[in-house]
Every structure is written in structure tokens, then in C-alpha cells.
């Protein structure tokens, strides 16, 4: 009796852990039987075709080969596919940034809300943030919350990220607090 | 107005696990970071770590890693300490504090405590 | 560790003027430690006063203020009352971290 393919699935060859960006990455599209024997393999992410090759290695695999993947054996007869398979990529916090709210510039006596961006996976699991002097500020939230904000805020900040991977920091981005009409006029 | 109601005394086993918790009231949890304190006659205040409670990130002083866990529910407006493999020196009285901003941190809320005893 | 330290207890009659100090080991207490000062009255009620060395929380009467004095924080309660008798913490950041003092008992005799 001739048949397509059987229980195709993709198996995670190597690292035999979690997998970290930059580890070198090789799964292989497996299945239990064929008649006749003789097959053709496909994977595909997101509907594109990546190779034609029972195993799909990465070299280094970045962030962005995360996602779900399958595989597809076909011989004669017909083909068959995989259960979609997820490939999730561990990495440090990157692209760290620190965005102002209401913006850079704020008017003494009102609120600022500074807030560490980033990309990482797991999700950062500590923040730190720094002034100008690298000094490390008593705050511990994504977010840092100044109201009301004063003149001497004035200055540049930079957040760093921790998750079980590693750290990342960001750039240093500068708060200008000016002084309110007020102050103005009783000087 | 602002409340922080923690759960009742504990009486625990020399190395056995222990859930503290810490319900807040009176405002929007996810704004403040919540921190705990221990409290001894010997040590007097001691800084433990703190959570926000937004994002599930903690700061931990270095003395109280793998000691005390830091978790919150935001659907409950609760924070939690666990403390593991418990011994006499964990004997104390602990506290939530609600850390306040404004144009500086302060300790501005505090729980009634919870005190924790370890004996056998 | 950095240790901070505090005078142990100080005596004031009412209507006096009374401050509290706080050393650190590290050296000299700068704004850099965000010195706080926090009461304790009996039953275990501690109410945060100071924040980053000199702003008063809401609603902490005005005759308490906080400062740095030579190399240590400070705190001034300006015309003590009786109901200001309790015990008085500092807590200094350590970098990356708190540091409480070991408390002033403060009698307003």
C-alpha cells in the first residue's frame, strides 16, 4: 500500500537547552514512515520557504528567526505537514532607549515620566537607572516619575536593563527643566 | 485614602517557607513601587528589596537574594514575600512601604507589619 | 556595607528646636544618598517625613525639615511638640541600595 508520509514533526537536534542568541541552532524534520520511501523535505516560517533539506541549521541565530516554523515531507503520493513548531530566541535587553513624557522639555513645577525601552527576552527583570555622573538613582520601575520636577533634573539619564541572559544600557538622553513664568518674574 | 493591610503573625518550622502579603488600597497599585522592610532588635531597619508592580521587576539587596522573592498581583492590588528555608535569624518584623516620588523617592506608606517567628 | 549612624536618644522640651543627625561609613552624606527620615510611634506606625534629603512629604507639618550639615543629613524639628516624641530613622541610598539607621529615640519631656 502506498501512502504520503506519516507523523511529521520538527525536533530541536541542538543546543539540547534554551535557546540564546548567537547559539548555533539545528532542527530536524522528522517522520515515522513513507511508501514509497523516497521524499523531498520543505520548511517554511510564516508561509516562506527557507530550504529543502530534512535539517535547517543556524549558523548564529539572531532575535529575529524567532517564530513558528514548519516542515513538509512529500513523496509521490502526497505530502504532509508538520504541527507548526515555535523557536523562541533568549537574548539580553537591546535597544535600549529612554523616552520623555511630556517630552525633553518641561516646565519646573509639572511631571516628567522617564521610561527605559527595550527589546529583550525574557522581559527585563531589573531596571537601574543612572544620571550624568553614572551615579545610580534610588529608583527600581521602568518608569521614573519626577512631579513635581525641578530645575536641578536638568540633565542626562541612561537606564539599564537586567534579564536572566544578561544587561544592556542605553544611550544617555537629556531632560532640560526651565524655570516657570513665575520664577521668572520674581527674579 | 492610601492603605497597606498585611496578613497576620506567623509561627514557622526552622526551614520551612513562609507567604507575606501586603494588600494596597486607596490608589492605583501599578504607580508605586512597593518595597519591604525587616525589622529586628539587633539589626534594627533593614532594606530587603523592592517590586514594581507594573512590570513584575525587582531590586533585591545583595543580603537577601535567595532569601526573599518579590511578586505582585495586579488584579488583587497585593504584594507578596516569600521567604524560604527559614531560621531564627529570619525571626522579624516585616513591612510593605509604598515608595513615593514626588521630586525625590521617600518611604512615604508603611503596613502595621507582619511579625514572623521561627521556632521549632 | 556602608553603617549609618544616629545619635541613639536625645531629650527636647516643647517648643524647643532639636536636630537629629545621620552619619554614614562610606563618608560624607552628599544629595547622591536621597537621605530619608521616617517616624515610629508605638504600635509599629511609621510614616515617611523627608525625602532626597530636604523635600517634606505632604502633609508633614512644616517644623520638621531636612538638610545636610557639614558631612552628615539632618534632621530639624523647629518648635518640638509632644506628639513629635518617637523614634526617628534615616535610610541612605548605598549605590544600589537602602541603608537604614539604627533610629534616634527622641523624648519631648
Known amino acids: 500500500v502506498q501512502y504520503a508520509p506519516r507523523d511529521v514533526r520538527v525536533r530541536k537536534i541542538k543546543p539540547l537547552s534554551e535557546i540564546h542568541s548567537g547559539n548555533s541552532v539545528s532542527l530536524q524534520c522528522d517522520f515515522s514512515s513513507s511508501h514509497p520511501k523516497e521524499v523531498q523535505f520543505f520548511w517554511e516560517k510564516n508561509g516562506r520557504l527557507l530550504g529543502k533539506e530534512s535539517q535547517l541549521n543556524f549558523d548564529s541565530i539572531s532575535p529575529e528567526d524567532a517564530g513558528s516554523y514548519s516542515c513538509w515531507v512529500n513523496n509521490s503520493i502526497g505530502q504532509t505537514a508538520s504541527k507548526a513548531w515555535t523557536l523562541e530566541v533568549l537574548y539580553a535587553p537591546r535597544r535600549l532607549r529612554v523616552s520623555m513624557s511630556p517630552g525633553d522639555q518641561v516646565m519646573e513645577g509639572k511631571s516628567a515620566t522617564l521610561t527605559c525601552e527595550s527589546d529583550a527576552n525574557p522581559p527585563v527583570s531589573h531596571y537601574t537607572w543612572f544620571d550624568w555622573n553614572n551615579q545610580s538613582l534610588p529608583y527600581h520601575s521602568q518608569k521614573l516619575r519626577l512631579e513635581p520636577v525641578k530645575v536641578q533634573h536638568s540633565g542626562a539619564y541612561w537606564c539599564q536593563g537586567t534579564n536572566s541572559v544578561g544587561k544592556g544600557r542605553s544611550p544617555l538622553s537629556t531632560l532640560t527643566v526651565y524655570y516657570s513664568p513665575e520664577t521668572i518674574g520674581r527674579r | 485614602q492610601v492603605q497597606l493591610q498585611q496578613s497576620g503573625a506567623e509561627l514557622v518550622r526552622p526551614g520551612a517557607s513562609v507567604t507575606l502579603s501586603c494588600k494596597a488600597s486607596g490608589y492605583t497599585f501599578t504607580d508605586y513601587e512597593m518595597h519591604w522592610v525587616k525589622q529586628t532588635p539587633v539589626h534594627g531597619l533593614e532594606w530587603i528589596g523592592a517590586i514594581d508592580p507594573e512590570t513584575g521587576a525587582t531590586a533585591y539587596n545583595q543580603k537577601f537574594k535567595g532569601k526573599a522573592i518579590l511578586t505582585a498581583d495586579k488584579s488583587s492590588s497585593t504584594a507578596y514575600m516569600d521567604l524560604r528555608s527559614l531560621t531564627s535569624e529570619d525571626s522579624a518584623v516585616y513591612y510593605c512601604?509604598?515608595?513615593?516620588?514626588?521630586?525625590?523617592?521617600?518611604?512615604?506608606?508603611w503596613g502595621q507589619g507582619t511579625l514572623v517567628t521561627v521556632s521549632a | 556595607q556602608a553603617v549609618v549612624t544616629q545619635e541613639s536618644a536625645l531629650t527636647t522640651s516643647p517648643g524647643e528646636t532639636v536636630t537629629l543627625t545621620c552619619r554614614s561609613s562610606?563618608?560624607?552624606?552628599?544629595?547622591?544618598?536621597?537621605a530619608n527620615w521616617v517616624q515610629e510611634k508605638p504600635d509599629h506606625l511609621f510614616t515617611g517625613l523627608i525625602g532626597g534629603t530636604n523635600n517634606r512629604a505632604p502633609g508633614v507639618p512644616a517644623r520638621f525639615s531636612g538638610s545636610l550639615i557639614g558631612d552628615k543629613a539632618a534632621l530639624t524639628i523647629t518648635g518640638a511638640q509632644t506628639e513629635d516624641e518617637a523614634i526617628y530613622f534615616c535610610a541612605l541610598w548605598n549605590s544600589n541600595h537602602w541603608v537604614f539607621g539604627g533610629g534616634t529615640k527622641l523624648t519631648v519631656l
Open positions: 562610606a563618608g560624607a552624606v552628599t544629595t547622591s544618598n536621597y
Open positions: 512601604t509604598r515608595y513615593d516620588y514626588g521630586s525625590s523617592p521617600w518611604f512615604a506608606y
